[in-house]
């Protein structure tokens, strides 16, 4: 915020290699954008679409990857009459090398090979118990043997000291196809590991981002209070205690003799205080006698504890 009225932005010579879809969000008022002096390889679809006031766009790069993902750019620039200050030449594929993007026929912007890595296995959302080891796996394929680098992000921040395992399996079709795998190892997870994880696989032709996979760290419920066997007389009040901790906070539920439909519940003589650990049965009757089970449950699992209520005639 505060930059929405900016009218001129110069990013000349900033080693920009690709322009992402939301690179200029919040800069809708821009009229002049200078990206000259950058060896730009790719511009994602609709990277400038929200810049309705754009009158002048400077690009000078002979590094463009002229594949199917760049097909949108020349007609968009021409349609917006922004081609005057754009000098954009293809570097790849070999058949288009040296050609201006404006002279390449639309049908020649194809993705026959995939020089930029393409994700083939996404990391999966995972639930883990505190103290366990977990891993996220991400695979990509590329028809380029250009060196590949791997990174993992947590909540959009690059993990600088990530415990990664990276390997490559080579297919030999018509030429080679490299299958790259990166595995993020998280050892003895804590609540601090919770978040959204994403892999970034990069080579000379650009970066590919996986989906974001959520890690939830849970703790099995454990009792802090358990019910005890009690013997009471009819017409008095029975009091059973039960409490548990865990992550997420466990829900407490009561059963009698393995079922939820029992006299005290049916007759509304059962009371559980919302913020208390006590389960009451008022005006106790003979048929309230039995085994009461307290179950504490969260997404990690459940535990149960039993107590026997013995009722004596008054």
């Amino acid at each position: 915020s505060g930059l929405d009225s900016l009218s001129k932005l110069t990013l000349f010579g900033n080693k920009i290699k690709s322009v992402a879809k939301r690179a200029f969000s919040g800069l809708e008022g821009l009229e002049h954008l200078n990206l000259g002096g950058n060896a730009i390889r790719s511009v994602q679809f609709d990277a400038f679409v929200k810049m309705k006031n754009l009158k002048e766009l400077h690009i000078s790069s002979d590094s463009f990857l002229c594949d199917c993902q760049l097909k949108w750019l020349p007609p968009w620039l021409i349609g917006r009459m922004l081609q005057a200050f754009v000098t954009a030449t293809c570097a790849h594929p070999e058949s288009l090398k040296g050609q201006s993007i404006f002279s390449v026929p639309p049908e020649s912007f194809v993705c026959d090979d995939f020089l930029k890595p393409q994700i083939i296995t996404q990391p999966e959302t995972t639930m883990a118990m505190v103290g366990k080891d977990i891993r996220f796996t991400c695979s990509a394929a590329s028809s380029s043997s250009s060196p590949m680098t791997f990174a993992w992000k947590k909540d959009n921040e690059v993990l600088t000291n990530a415990d990664m395992e990276n390997f490559v399996h080579v297919h030999a079709q018509d030429g080679e196809v490299m299958e790259y795998t990166t595995i993020l190892h998280l050892r003895q997870v804590t609540f601090g590991h919770e978040g959204r994880y994403q892999c970034v696989i990069t080579n000379h032709f650009g970066s590919t981002y996986s989906h974001k996979a959520r890690l939830t760290v849970n703790v099995l419920p454990s009792f802090t209070k358990t019910p005890h066997d009690i013997t009471i007389r009819t017409t008095t009040m029975a009091r059973l205690e039960c409490a548990a901790t865990g992550h997420p906070n466990p829900q407490i539920a009561w059963q009698k003799d393995g079922g939820t439909d029992f006299p005290a519940a049916r007759e509304r003589r059962m009371h559980v205080m919302p913020d208390d650990d006590v389960f009451f049965i008022t005006d106790v009757k003979i048929d309230d006698a039995g085994v009461y089970s307290c179950t504490a449950q969260n997404s990690a699992g459940s535990i149960s504890a039993n107590a026997t209520l013995t009722v004596l005639e008054t």
Partner: antibody, heavy 127, light 111 residues
Amino acid sequence: EVQLLESGGGLVQPGGSLRLSCAASGFTFSNYAMSWVRQAPGKGLEWVSVISHGGGSTYYADSVKGRFTISRDNSKNTLYLQMNSLRAEDTAVYYCARVISNCHLGVCYYSNGMDVWGQGTLVTVSS
Amino acid sequence: QLVLTQPPSVSAAPGQRVSISCSGSSSNIGDNYVSWYQQVPGSAPKLLIYDNNKRPSGIPDRFSASKSGTSATLGITGLQTGDEADYYCATWDGSLSAGRVFGGGTKLTVL
């Protein structure tokens, strides 16, 4: 000298379990993917499982999936194969083998070949 | 059933050349590198060729291999009695996750 030495084979009843070990020496174990291959008496070679150099990825033949677990302890230079719910058709000599791997700048390139093999350990499943 | 097909046996006289074929499909040989192994009875397999045509150190150049489409071939020239063994081709079937497959093996007899 580069060497792989399997152990843990023996006679086990159908439905039983066995854990094979493969001790590696003479090379940097943590830089190599490792594999188990078996050979039933008088039969050909059958690939069983492979594990990546850091242990993060494991792959299995359909015939053992869900019953066998490959693992490794890079601190002990040892590869393992935990075999559960064993069947008569699992009777074979089990070999551990090193996958040709070339590690550079934190990335290991796996070749198609298995260049170092152990002498094998015989597993017999019979009642 | 076996995914890679090899002839059960081949034979030739010492000094001669012999070829062993290995036939697969587009998802295995067609899409992946092939390796070849030699197994002398009573011994562990030994790698002869990897990545279609590369020889590990110590393997003589009498052993060579090639791949065309969905088939691969191992060639042995200047046959010696010590070459009498079983020979297996191997490759990945589909992707890395689908695993490795071996041919049924070919028994080479040196007459």
